[in-house]
Interface confidence: low
């Protein structure tokens, strides 16, 4: 803060506002009878320079004129843009202990004259809005600069508004507060912007426009849609618009889409028919308006209308598969499975499925509806059976999909050859095969079916399957494939009335099993030891087990154990070993091996064979 200048005055020449690059002379004068007491000649006037309230320079060496004890003039150069504060102080040199006393101060502003404003743009939002213009001010002036926006038009129409820019606010837009009405549609208006500050002034070029050039219609409102006869694909979009609108742009898309459908509508009068909608789909609709076919600006997009189109009857074909299990000599259980239609095929909420099992020759028909995607029935083992399934929503049902029930693995000649399963990554398995060698009927299609090899998976979980054309010999299976789980994979070759299959196990990722098999019993029969075990719990297998290892060694021996490997069979849980010495106590344990390595050992059991050595 500058004290009120009681001791003296500070003046600036040529002025306190100067152009960039100019010098200024600052004079500091003491008032009469002010200064250091008794010794006027000891008065020393000093000038201090402050930027942003920080002392940056003592201008002692810049004196250009000095009336000792009365006044001093300092020349300041190289001032930076913006405001600089200079404070004159009195230093009484005979009193070293007293600090200099402020005399007076002055602020010098360094800036530039304004450039002519450019790129004037005016808009009026809606027929009842007001005209607002914006412009580019050019380089920052670093000075308070006044801007005047002037509009002139027909019938001696004139109007102006002002604003200013300084270091706290920027002025590059003004609302004139007047409304241009449609009856002036053909009239021409001129605006210009004038900028003035202490260093000069400038004016923009005149900017000419018409009503149509600047009026941006308000976005349409009250948007709604009517679906003709509850159609899921045809609807009439309706909306409200300002009276002068002649052109509309419509855009619409399903909610999960990334690209809009665009439509231009001339003289729509707030109504437009859409014919290509997808049934039972959430859509977003927006509309924009324009007042003139060729000129003018589009309004902002309206608020979105979000709605779902009505249902229509399902289309498409269900993907059906089945399992066949003999119950006894004259009955079999048929389990039908099918995949849900995708939304574009379902075209609504599927309420139920119509399932039919028909014996072709005897014309026996079993029918049922179910809300599930599977259906199980017990039927006679005799006769040729066919199944069909259709999906129904509130508007109707899809065409039934038929499948012949054949013995899926009944024909060895139709069994695919050289089936392999390779892990591709964490989520999928590549299955490849060769066609049947001596098929006596043409392969119509291959079905690759897979199921996790876990207890109860056949009864608890439906199979997963892929239909493969007859000329393809590979499939990448990914649905419900998880790492560290073993799957039984079957490749079926189907002809019109027969089926053959080959099976393999595979996993998408494997680790060594967490634990080894648990030995439950060791029995001696005919000089051989039978080792019985329980399998590793399914989650701890961590992939497909390739084989088991049975280890044995003499109880107190430090030698490496002996071992035998047994190929993994889910149904097998005992195995004989021989060549053990009688009346020697052995320690036995088991491990399991996957493609990733060996499990830790299972429990240890001791056993002392009694029989003769082999």
């Amino acid at each position: 803060n500058i004290d009120v200048c009681k001791l003296g005055t500070v003046t600036v020449q040529p002025a306190p506002v100067i152009p960039l690059g100019s010098a200024a002379n600052i004079s500091c004068s003491l008032n009469p009878k002010q200064g250091c007491s008794h010794y006027p000649s000891s008065n020393e006037l000093i000038l201090l320079k402050f930027v942003n309230d920080v002392l940056v320079e003592n201008l002692h060496g810049k004196k250009v004129h000095d009336h000792t004890g009365h006044s001093s003039t300092f020349q300041v150069t190289n001032l930076s843009l913006g405001m600089t504060l200079f404070v004159c102080k009195l230093n009484c040199s005979n009193s070293q202990k007293k600090p200099p006393v402020p005399v007076c101060g002055v602020e010098i502003s360094v800036g530039v004259a304004p450039e002519p404003p450019q790129n004037i743009s005016c808009v009026q939002e809606g027929e009842n809005g007001t005209v607002a213009c914006s412009w580019n001010s050019g380089k920052v002036t670093y000075l308070k600069t006044n801007y005047t926006l002037q509009l002139s038009g027909p019938n001696n129409l004139t109007c102006q508004k002002q604003c200013f820019s300084d270091n706290r606010q920027n002025c590059n837009r003004l609302d004139l507060g007047i409304n241009l009405s449609p009856d002036l549609a053909e009239s021409r208006f001129i605006v210009r912007v004038t900028a003035i500050n202490d260093l000069g002034n400038s004016s923009s070029l005149p900017h000419t426009f018409t009503f149509l050039d600047i009026v941006i219609p308000l976005p349409p409102w009250d948007i709604r849609i009517n679906f003709l006869n509850a159609s899921g694909s045809r609807g009439t979009l309706q909306w409200e618009d300002e009276g002068q609108v002649v052109l509309n742009q419509l855009r619409y898309q399903p909610l999960n889409s990334t690209s809009w459908n665009m439509v231009n509508a001339t003289n729509a009068k707030g109504k437009y028919d859409l014919r290509d909608l997808r049934p039972f789909t959430e859509y977003e609709f927006q509309i924009s308006s324009k007042l003139h076919l060729s000129g003018g600006s589009w309004s902002n997009w309206s608020e979105s209308l979000r709605t779902r189109t009505p249902e229509e009857e399902p289309v498409g074909i269900l993907d059906i598969w089945y399992m066949k299990q003999d119950i006894d000599y004259d009955r079999q259980q048929i389990s039908l499975f099918w995949k849900s239609l995708n939304p574009s095929e379902a075209r609504g909420k599927i309420l139920h499925y119509q399932v039919t099992l028909q014996e072709v020759t005897k014309k026996t028909t079993l029918q049922n509806t179910t809300r599930h995607t599977s259906w199980t029935r017990v039927i006679p083992r005799t006769g040729a059976w066919t199944a069909s399934v259709s999906a129904a929503n509130s508007k109707g049902a899809s065409a039934p999909t038929h499948i012949n029930i054949v013995d899926l693995c009944g024909t060895g000649l139709l069994a695919p050859h050289q089936v392999s399963a390779k892990s591709e990554n964490m989520d999928n398995i590549l299955v490849t095969w060769q066609p049947p060698k001596k098929a006596d009927s043409a392969v119509r299609e291959y079905i690759v079916e897979w199921r996790a090899l876990q207890p109860g998976s056949i009864t608890k979980f439906p199979p997963h399957w892929l239909r493969i054309p007859p000329d393809n010999m590979s499939a990448l299976i990914s649905e419900n494939i998880k790492p560290y789980i073993c799957y039984e994979i079957r490749v079926h070759a189907l002809s019109e009335s027969q089926g053959g299959c080959s099976s393999i196990r595979g996993d998408s990722k494997h680790k060594a099993p967490v634990s080894g098999p648990h030995i439950t019993a060791i029995t001696e029969k005919k000089e051989r030891l039978f080792i019985s075990w329980t399998h590793i719990p399914f989650p701890e297998q961590r992939g497909c087990i390739l084989h088991y290892r049975i280890y044995w060694k003499e109880r107190d021996s430090t030698a490496q154990p002996e071992l035998c490997e047994i190929q993994y069979r889910r149904s097998q849980n005992s195995h004989p070993i021989s060549s053990l010495q009688p009346r020697v106590t052995y320690v036995l344990w088991m491990t399991a091996v996957t493609a990733a390595g060996e499990s830790p050992q299972g429990n240890e059991r001791e056993f002392c064979p009694q029989g003769k050595a082999n």
Partner: nanobody
Framework: QVQLQESGGGLVQAGDFLRLSCVFS????????MGWFRQAPGKEREFVAA????????QYAEAVKGRFTISRDNAKSTVYLQMSSLKPEDTAVYYC???????????????????WGQGTQVTVSS
């Protein structure tokens, strides 16, 4: 990418109890077994407790048996460690760990767990 976030640590008196939580994200929680480990200053990370994906099998380090209980809520994708009768020697950073496999046996080394949280500090004052 699996992420684990522990919470619930703090400063307690000896004999008090504390419940740690670990929220799992970025995968299917029900496919993972979960474990708690701890690491005291200057010591190696050591096993505390583990629980199978289904929650039907649990294991504990000898030092915490009878005092700590591990549990899980598959609906909330969260595993808990209820700690009671806390002792000063329980002071450590407690880490939550996850792995698609569940190891049964004494060798619960940290290397058997694939995914780890950042840890939560538990300090037990005497």
């Amino acid at each position: 990418q699996v992420q684990l976030q522990e919470s619930g640590g703090g400063l307690v008196q000896a004999g008090d109890f504390l419940r740690l939580s670990c929220v799992f994200s970025g995968g299917t929680f029900g496919d993972y077994s979960m474990g708690w480990f701890r690491q005291a200053p200057g010591k190696e990370r050591e096993f505390v407790a583990a629980i199978r994906w289904s929650g039907d099998s649990t294991q504990y380090a000898e030092a915490v048996k009878g005092r700590f209980t591990i549990s899980r809520d598959n609906a909330k994708s969260t595993v808990y460690l209820q700690m009671s009768s806390l002792k000063p020697e329980d002071t450590a950073v407690y880490y939550c760990a996850a792995d698609p496999s569940y190891y049964i046996g004494p060798n619960h080394t940290p290397s058997r767990y694939r995914d780890w949280g950042q840890g939560t500090q538990v300090t037990v004052s005497s």
